[in-house]
Amino acid sequence: HLYPGEVCPGMDIRNNLTRLHELENCSVIEGHLQILLMFKTRPEDFRDLSFPKLIMITDYLLLFRVYGLESLKDLFPNLTVIRGSRLFFNYALVIFEMVHLKELGLYNLMNITRGSVRIEKNNELCYLATIDWSRILDSVEDNYIVLNKDDNEECGDICPGTAKGKTNCPATVINGQFVERCWTHSHCQKVCPTICKSHGCTAEGLCCHSECLGNCSQPDDPTKCVACRNFYLDGRCVETCPPPYYHFQDWRCVNFSFCQDLHHKCKNSRRQGCHQYVIHNNKCIPECPSGYTMNSSNLLCTPCLGPCPKVCHLLEGEKTIDSVTSAQELRGCTVINGSLIINIRGGNNLAAELEANLGLIEEISGYLKIRRSYALVSLSFFRKLRLIRGETLEIGNYSFYALDNQNLRQLWDWSKHNLTITQGKLFFHYNPKLCLSEIHKMEEVSGTKGRQERNDIALKTNGDQASCENELLKFSYIRTSFDKILLRWEPYWPPDFRDLLGFMLFYKEAPYQNVTEFDGQDACGSNSWTVVDIDPPLRSNDPKSQNHPGWLMRGLKPWTQYAIFVKTLVTFSDERRTYGAKSDIIYVQTDATNPSVPLDPISVSNSSSQIILKWKPPSDPNGNITHYLVFWERQAEDSELFELDYCLKGLKLPSRTWSPPFESEDSQKHNQSEYEDSAGECCSCPKTDSQILKELEESSFRKTFEDYLHNVVFVPRKTSSGTGAEDPRPS
């Protein structure tokens, strides 16, 4: 009797009615039920559709734009409980833009355990004022029932018997009104004696067992409930799951092997978003609670030492990151169980996006392969990568593999980054802009020195197109004004002076002195540095009178710190050996100057001898503002003010009393009274600030809800099947 049919997973039924038949044998939907976006359905399509076995939905019920559906009384005649374990934007029942729905008709709905109700923009929907929601859920004040036909007082809601002058349905008091309670013209709302609480009662008004929820077929018997208040086990409702059982999904008891099967099904499946269920404190749960991490071998949650790692298990043991989208799938991961292959050829704002998605990875159990990633300039987006275990290796026993990365110039800033490679070798070939010194530094830091064989690091195809600077350029002269910086640096000439094509000056605003050369750079044009090309100076034969190259940086912001460095631009020599020089990054601040004008000055007189002046600080202070200068001068009076007869009738009263100029302009506008010309008639009172605020909040809340609904509901079609949609799981 208790849950006679099957337990079905959450469903998203859209576009047409074909999938609705999957509900046929469901007693419980473990998850949510969304029925939506059916624009071609007609009332007759729903005539013979009924799912009498459906008793409970564990999450929420959402109906949105289903045309032709006029009532739910035949569709879900026995739906008794919506648990609201996971909610849709705080709601357990959402009826939104159901253009043909005339009544809810859920006449057996007795309990919404958690969450509230949102019924909005249903032009034909009546029988709302006849429902006492306080008998169904606790948080009635959070219900949002607006913009339905019911609002316009156009509904002639008639409860059963009313037409014959009888009152068949129970009446309850809401807001001081004693109203008959019904769902449709033929179905009363069932109201049990208050002593029964939410357990429900029989038709005779006898209370159900305290473990029941909503209804029962016999009083005081936990095996005769229609739904359970706590947990369901072996045909009865129980307060808690006794060992050997585990609590599952907040409503039923399952054994260990059930939980284990769920875990392994997910682990072995390729489906995104499934949960590798774990066991913790008598519960079989989708993931470990915060502060715990999963031990995959025994399904346990073990306490984390420090911040919890997020272990991401890669299907087939490896994952190729070839776009920002594929990087997003690893967002938040701290440990990669498998190997990563980076193959990024292009994209927008890559360095920042990759850091946002891969920047928390601390450990890779397999290997890391960077292959034909033309867009990468640096690997610094792996900001926290500290360990490559090399438990699985690339062919040839490599745990770090870099091949054909045309623009890769830096691995990490080795002065700030530690990386250990437990086992496996390094492989570097065809990375023309990556200097060998950078690779050798990695060997030292990572502990792989001595592991590599002769051809693992190609001497001729790494750094062969780079100016692998081995000399340090020093600035010899720095002068600042409020919008300019003049720089000079020591001259540099390669062995063949004709190889020097010039210098590149890099600069950018840097509020903090923590900038590195490759921050924010990729090879697709994203570069946080401004670059200036500077011709080499004229070469003098006298080494003592060499011209110091330099540049005047113009159009800078006053009182702003800039990070600056300069490097040489040299030709590629025949011997496949390049020279060059580069400066350290220096920080220079421009001078202060006059601030821009103060903003939004307001002046008000509050007496015959005072003027109050208020303003906002300038948008560009251009330095530390220490004080303001206020100038004023007396103006001649307007002659009209003297000539006006102030006793003339018909003059309007002043529209508002003086108030200090500290409110926003909007609130001042709202405070103005609008007096009407028609004498003797009362004017409408202005809205109070709190009313206006409430209206603004409500309008904003409505927009937020609609945005949320559209974001969740409108999803791209699956390319494979062409029907259905992704299964979003809001909470």
């Epitope: 936990p222 072996d234 129980v238 307060e239 006794p242 060992p243 260990f256 346990l300």
Partner: antibody, heavy 116, light 110 residues
Amino acid sequence: EVQLLESGGGLVQPGGSLRLSCAASGFTFSDYYMNWVRQAPGKGLEWVALISYDGSNKYYADSVKGRFTISRDNSKNTLYLQMNSLRAEDTALYYCASQSTAFDIWGQGTLVTVSS
Amino acid sequence: QSVLTQPPSASGTPGQRVTISCSGSSSNIGRRTVNWYQQLPGTAPKLLIYDNNKRPSGVPDRFSGSKSGTSASLAISGLRSEDEADYYCATWDDSLNGWVFGGGTKLTVL
């Protein structure tokens, strides 16, 4: 008053049989899993057997499997433990205990002595 | 040999705080909640703590329980002479498919 009262203990020879009963009162007997737990003289507690609400599921400790049978009669609010092929090491004070997630209610115990 | 390991004895003076440990494995404490029982001399055991750290009504708040990983512990603060008893931890073991108890800890109030 909530209580469990065990009976049926006594002296029995090795290989013999004994049937213990546990009468429940003051609570809804059928709403609980029921257990037998024993304690050998001067020793710690040892779980013996468990039965579900309606008797459809039963669990036994390895040490008694195949020799002991747990059963219940919800109409009489009584739990039973049929003990066959008794051994000297089965000598103990036998408690019945009701269970939700823990053993909430305990009886005072009945002593079973297996000796020749 | 008990599946759950407890120290055989513990002691303290009145007013002191004592802690009794209970160590298990992944198949029991690791995935289950732990219960603690008090057995006063010559009486039946009584439930003291259930679900790791919850006290049944009537149990003073001087008794508290906790669990971490595959170990649990019972703490008794403000020790009194009437606390002198045997204390047992227990939980369900999924490998053995049955309840398991610790060997018990005899608490002496000096």
